[in-house]
Interface confidence: low
């Protein structure tokens, strides 16, 4: 038919930081590239319809759908979706083609479904369908990356089977203990699966896709190393690949490494062997012990020996289940208002955990860090001296685990007070819990020394508001007392405060706060 | 257990060659590197050549362009050639996988 226009149908995903999407969807916005999604007419369909290629998007993510019609002279047009009309603005761009945009922000289920565009033209009406759902994230797997040995080479392949199929990225790094970490000089990062280079000091391989990243260490055991005071450990599950790698250096090549397990020499094809000159001369030789599938008797004592240094044990223990294990009993603790304190969890996890800290319903970021006896610890400093609940959550595939904190902080209580016509009440959050007292202000007593002890109701911890408990104190009002001024005043180890309360017939009660 | 057992050696005439071979058990073999060594008299085992599991070879610097080395991972077998050979030669030839060294075999050269 010549009478139809040429039609382009694009998806422009945006980036999450994106400013410039929420604004009238007539903006042009900057964005990715956008995508084409090749509007095709529909056959046997009524009336002229076009069916762009079905959207996925991610849950959160921000797309537009455009139109771009190459047809002469104006054009309106009205979006349809789930049977409500959407407000259409089209505009032209610098070659003269009607754009027609829809912004979806912050995709969720709600916003998946059928958008029915309907355009009319001077010419000809015609309809655009665009299908758009929500990525099945479901589907998406990150597993920790494992290694394999390359045939035929001197090389190691990391894999890592998670879907969307994940970057694979080595992280190598040939000095000693903190300045390994990710942000270091030190530490030199190679995008690809197969590693030549097998001799440095620390040698992790990292997969990453939608999901995050996980990496793999390659377990070492370096006989050049004072060992440490306990026996490394490394778990494994059952069916999962063992990789341990024994290095040595030497002044020349008059060594060989080999491998026991429990006193017996590793069975033939579970070994190989690397070498190399170092730059002052040296040899270095790294023997590699390996398991594609262990099974519970691969449990045991690994030892790496050398003709020329002092061997050095792994203890390799193989599980059925992962675990998180760690003492879950809830810790409180009570520190002044400006000491320096952290909480820390202290724990022993295989597979490696996922972790956060939680206060007052934010989440934090949660850095776990190895220590030399095969635990973990994850700390937490951020608290900025808020008392309360603080609960540390972690998990692996096959466990979780939670650890719940108090923190109290130790300060001179401060004092609100409210009134109605029956009665007025004090409430305080210091720490420790304070102590009440009621004073009648009267011509007998001008500096309120005149203690009320008749209807006074003292409820401590009454309200626990992030875990921090405030304490009240209620004066139900009597003849005696109504139209005299009184003070309540709650006090700790730490000093007393105090607030004065008119008790008046009904009305606005005026407070004076008396330090 | 990894067995080697090295032979070709005997007595040559200076400037004449040798093939040494080694033959070894197990079936670690294609998998690892294989080093040749030899021990003169009275001095201390001195490492002569390596070829890794991929076939790359390494050779002691003053030896290079004498001697080559290399493997026959079907016949379980590393060789080692000895070209041009010198009086200063004269050793027992060992060959070692791992921490397991052969028998050794002796290389005499005279002038």
């Known amino acids: 038919n010549q009478d139809l226009p040429v039609i382009k149908c694009v998806l422009i995903n945006h980036k999450n930081n994106d400013s410039s999407v929420g604004k009238s969807s007539s903006y042009p916005m900057v964005s990715e590239s956008p995508e084409d999604l090749g509007c095709a007419l529909r056959p046997q369909s009524s009336g002229t319809v076009y069916e762009a290629a079905a959207v996925e998007v991610d849950v959160s993510a921000s797309i537009t759908l455009q139109v771009l019609v190459d047809a002469p002279g104006n054009i309106s047009c009205l979006w349809v979706f789930k049977h409500s009309s959407l407000n259409c603005q089209p505009h032209f761009d610098l070659q003269n083609r009607g754009v027609v945009s829809m912004v979806i922000l912050k995709m969720t289920e709600t916003q998946a479904g059928e958008y029915l565009l309907f355009i009319q033209s001077e010419a000809t009406n015609y309809t655009i369908l665009f299908t758009v759902s929500i990525r099945n994230t479901l589907l998406y797997t990150l597993r920790r990356p494992y290694f394999r040995k390359m045939e035929n080479q001197d090389a190691l392949v990391c894999i890592s089977e998670s879907v969307p199929e994940p970057i694979v990225e080595w992280v190598l790094c040939d000095s000693q203990g903190e300045s390994c970490k990710e942000e270091s000089p030190a530490v030199v990062k190679k995008e690809e699966k197969v590693l030549h280079e097998l001799f440095g000091t620390d040698i992790r391989c990292c997969a990453r896709n939608e999901l995050g990243r996980e990496c793999t260490r390659l377990f070492t055991i370096d006989l050049n190393q004072t060992p440490q005071t306990t026996l490394p450990q490394l778990f494994l599950k059952v069916g999962e690949p063992l990789w341990i790698r024994c290095k040595a250096v030497h002044v020349n090549h008059g060594f060989g490494l080999t491998w026991e397990l429990e006193n017996k020499a590793l069975e033939e094809g579970n070994y190989f062997e690397m070498s190399t000159y170092s730059t002052n001369r040296t040899m270095i030789r790294i023997l590699f012990a390996f398991v594609s599938s262990v099974a519970r008797n691969d449990t045991g004592y690994y030892t790496c020996s050398s003709s020329k240094h002092p061997s050095q044990s792994a203890l390799v223990t193989i599980v059925e289940k992962g675990f998180i294990n760690a003492t879950n009993s809830s810790e409180d603790y009570e520190i002044d208002q400006y000491e320096e304190f952290c909480f820390s969890v202290r724990f022993k996890a295989y597979p490696q955990i996922r972790c956060t800290w939680t206060f007052s319903r934010k989440s934090f970021p949660c850095e776990q860090k190895g220590l030399d006896n095969g635990y973990s610890i994850s700390k937490f400093c951020n608290h900025k001296h808020q008392p309360g609940e603080y609960i540390f959550h972690a998990e692996n595939d096959d466990a979780q685990f939670t650890k719940m904190f108090t923190l109290n902080i130790r300060r001179k209580p401060q004092v609100l007070a409210e009134a109605s016509a029956s009665q007025a009440s004090c409430f305080s959050d210091g720490y420790p819990l304070p102590s009440w007292t009621w004073k009648k202000c009267s011509d007998k007593s001008p500096n309120c020394t005149e203690e009320i002890t008749e209807g006074v109701w003292n409820r401590k911890a009454n309200r626990k508001v992030f875990g921090q408990w405030v304490s009240s104190s209620t004066l139900n009002m009597s003849e005696a007392i109504k139209g005299f001024l009184v003070k309540c005043c709650a006090y700790n180890s730490l000093g007393t405060s105090c607030e004065t309360i008119l008790l008046n017939s009904p009305g606005p009660f005026p407070f004076i706060q008396d330090n | 257990q990894v067995q080697l057992q090295e032979s070709g050696g005997g007595l040559v005439q200076a400037g004449g060659s040798l093939r040494l071979s080694c033959a070894a058990s197990?079936?670690?073999?294609?998998?690892?590197?294989i080093d040749w060594y030899r021990q003169a008299p009275g001095k201390q085992r001195e490492w002569v050549a390596q070829?890794?599991?991929?076939?790359?070879?390494h050779y002691e610097p003053s030896l290079k362009g004498r001697f080559t080395i290399s493997r026959d991972n079907a016949k379980n077998t590393a060789y080692l050639q000895m070209n041009s050979l010198k009086p200063e030669d004269t050793a027992v030839y060992y060959c070692?996988?791992?921490?397991?060294w052969g028998q050794g075999t002796q290389v005499t050269v005279s002038s």
């Open positions: 197990g079936s670690t073999f294609s998998r690892n590197y």
């Open positions: 070829i890794t599991s991929a076939g790359n070879t």
């Open positions: 070692r996988i791992l921490d397991y």
